[in-house]
């Protein structure tokens, strides 16, 4: 008798997801001498075994605990970068400044960034179909859980100033409801945590304006002065230049106005 | 359990290529990491360079940059390496391993004899 | 590159007896060495990674310690098919880089 698969909303797990996850973690062992010492099978198995098997719209943080043991790594102090829905411009700024790290230059950002998974309650197949969607769905699918999960313990460890990359083309530039605003800000530990400096990242050449008076951003001050963490603002109005001057901090150009400081 | 098989004895000109087959079966072989190791006459062991199949991208050592080429061919879980403009002094037994910095299968070892 | 130093180049023990292998890095490894077996006309054995972790189906007898520059490889009681060529090898920069070798033969 043909069992009837569960249609999601959301897409299907990324082709080749065994192969990817294990991959990615030989080839980030490879490259990061603190991390030899992790056992490349024995994360794939801690990672499927958090979904295999279990309904896709049941899924907590504690079963990724064994994962997010096995793949245990620290940021130095002053080195943290979070991000809000400017990904790729945080990226290539760690590519860059080789000594600060978000979420995804560490192991278990980079094994599953950019992936969907899930599987299926009570069989060892993993759905190609179909994935719960956050919103249509379920909030509690194996992706979103992941990303809370590993987003919260990245921002329960980061010490000293921590940074965050914010986009400044978006109505809301900071967004309660993205995984910054519901997790990240509110694990940060005020204990280890001296101040959050916002860098707000200008979409239009000729936008000159002040940024950092947004109300979203006032929101954000206010939520992070709550939590006796000191909140810093700059406006980056040129990103192209930011980047450039992070690659050549000799040039003469860079000396001025590729960002505006805010105290508060 | 994983195997790797590499292909039989070559015998080369100064001045050649040589090209060196690794063939895995009993396991996974897209995404573990495929090294290669010769060992001179005598001689210890020198890591020559290393490849994860799934990327294909080869990772090489500076001295033999520009002379060695790692390939892989997932469909047939096979690894290669070719060493161009051969000299004497590359007369030595190669060996494909399991891993990219930590070696924990061998093949059996491929002996190339560069002889004029 | 980082330069292994082994010694002794061949270390003579009678059977039963404890054998210590030294290995030096030029410069810090970490914990980020392995220790490899070699008995003639075959492939070498991964006998210890990570400075001190054993192996798949590696005996008890065989131990390592050891981190940054200085390395020791013990095997407690050797037995007869111990005797062999025991290379150390670091994995912390690249290029990989091995030593030159300790024979451990009969006495």
């Known amino acids: 008798v043909p069992r009837w698969r569960q249609q999601w909303s959301g897409s299907g797990t990324t082709s080749r997801f065994p192969e990817t996850v294990l991959a990615r973690c030989v080839k980030y062992t490879e490259v990061h001498p603190e991390m030899r010492h992790v056992d490349c099978q024995s994360v794939w198995d801690a990672f499927k075994g958090a979904f295999i098997s279990k309904y896709p719209c049941n899924i907590t943080e504690e079963d990724y605990q064994p994962l997010v043991k096995l793949g245990t790594q620290t940021v130095p102090c002053n080195k943290t970068l979070l991000w809000s829905r400017i990904k790729d411009l945080a990226h290539q700024f760690t590519q860059v400044q080789r000594d600060m790290f978000t979420l995804e230059d560490m192991l278990l950002g980079y094994l599953a960034d950019d992936l969907t998974w899930c599987g299926e309650f009570n069989t060892f197949e993993i759905n190609y179909q179909s994935c719960p969607d956050w919103r249509k769905d379920c909030s509690n699918n194996p992706v979103s859980v992941f990303w809370k999960t590993v987003s919260r313990r990245f921002a329960e460890t980061a010490c000293g100033v921590v940074h965050v990359m914010l986009n400044g083309s978006r109505s809301k530039i900071f967004d309660k409801n993205s995984t910054f605003g519901s997790v990240e800000v509110h694990n940060l530990q005020p204990e280890k945590v001296q101040a959050l400096e916002a860098w707000v990242i200008h979409g239009g050449r000729e936008d000159s304006r002040d940024l950092c008076q947004d109300p979203t951003i006032k929101e954000l001050e206010s939520i992070i002065s709550k939590r006796n963490i000191r909140f810093f603002c700059k406006n980056i109005y040129r990103p192209d230049k930011f980047l450039q001057c992070v690659k050549n901090p000799e040039d003469s150009s860079c000396l001025s106005g590729i960002h505006h400081h805010h105290h508060h | 359990q994983v195997q790797l098989v590499q292909s039989g004895a070559e015998v080369k000109k100064p001045g050649s290529s040589v090209k060196v087959s690794c063939k895995a079966s009993g396991g996974l072989f897209s995404f573990y990491a495929i090294s290669w190791v010769r060992q001179a006459p005598g001689q210890g062991l020198e890591w020559m360079g290393g490849?994860?199949?799934?990327?294909?991208?080869?990772q090489y050592a500076q001295k033999f940059q520009g002379r060695v080429t790692i390939t892989a061919d997932e469909s047939t879980s096979t690894a290669y390496m070719e060493l161009s403009s051969l000299r004497s002094e590359d007369t030595a037994v190669y060996y494909c391993?399991?891993?990219?910095?930590?070696?924990?299968?061998w093949g059996q070892g491929t002996l190339v004899t560069v002889s004029a | 590159e980082i330069v292994m130093t082994q010694s002794p180049a061949t270390l003579s023990v009678s059977p039963g007896e404890r054998a210590t292998l030294s290995c030096r890095a030029s410069q810090s490894v970490s914990s980020n060495l392995a220790w490899y077996q070699q008995k003639p006309g075959q492939a070498p054995r991964l006998l210890i990674y990570?400075?001190?972790t054993r192996a798949t189906g590696i005996p008890a007898r065989f131990s390592g310690s050891g981190s940054g520059t200085e390395f020791t490889l013990t095997i407690s009681s050797l037995q007869s098919e111990d005797f062999a060529v025991y290379y150390c090898?670091?994995?912390?920069?690249?290029?990989?880089?091995f030593g030159q070798g300790t024979k451990v033969e009969i006495k």
């Open positions: 391993a399991r891993g990219s910095y930590r070696f924990d299968v």
């Open positions: 490849i994860i199949p799934f990327f294909g991208e080869p």
């Open positions: 090898q670091q994995y912390n920069n690249w290029p990989w880089t």
């Open positions: 990570g400075a001190s």
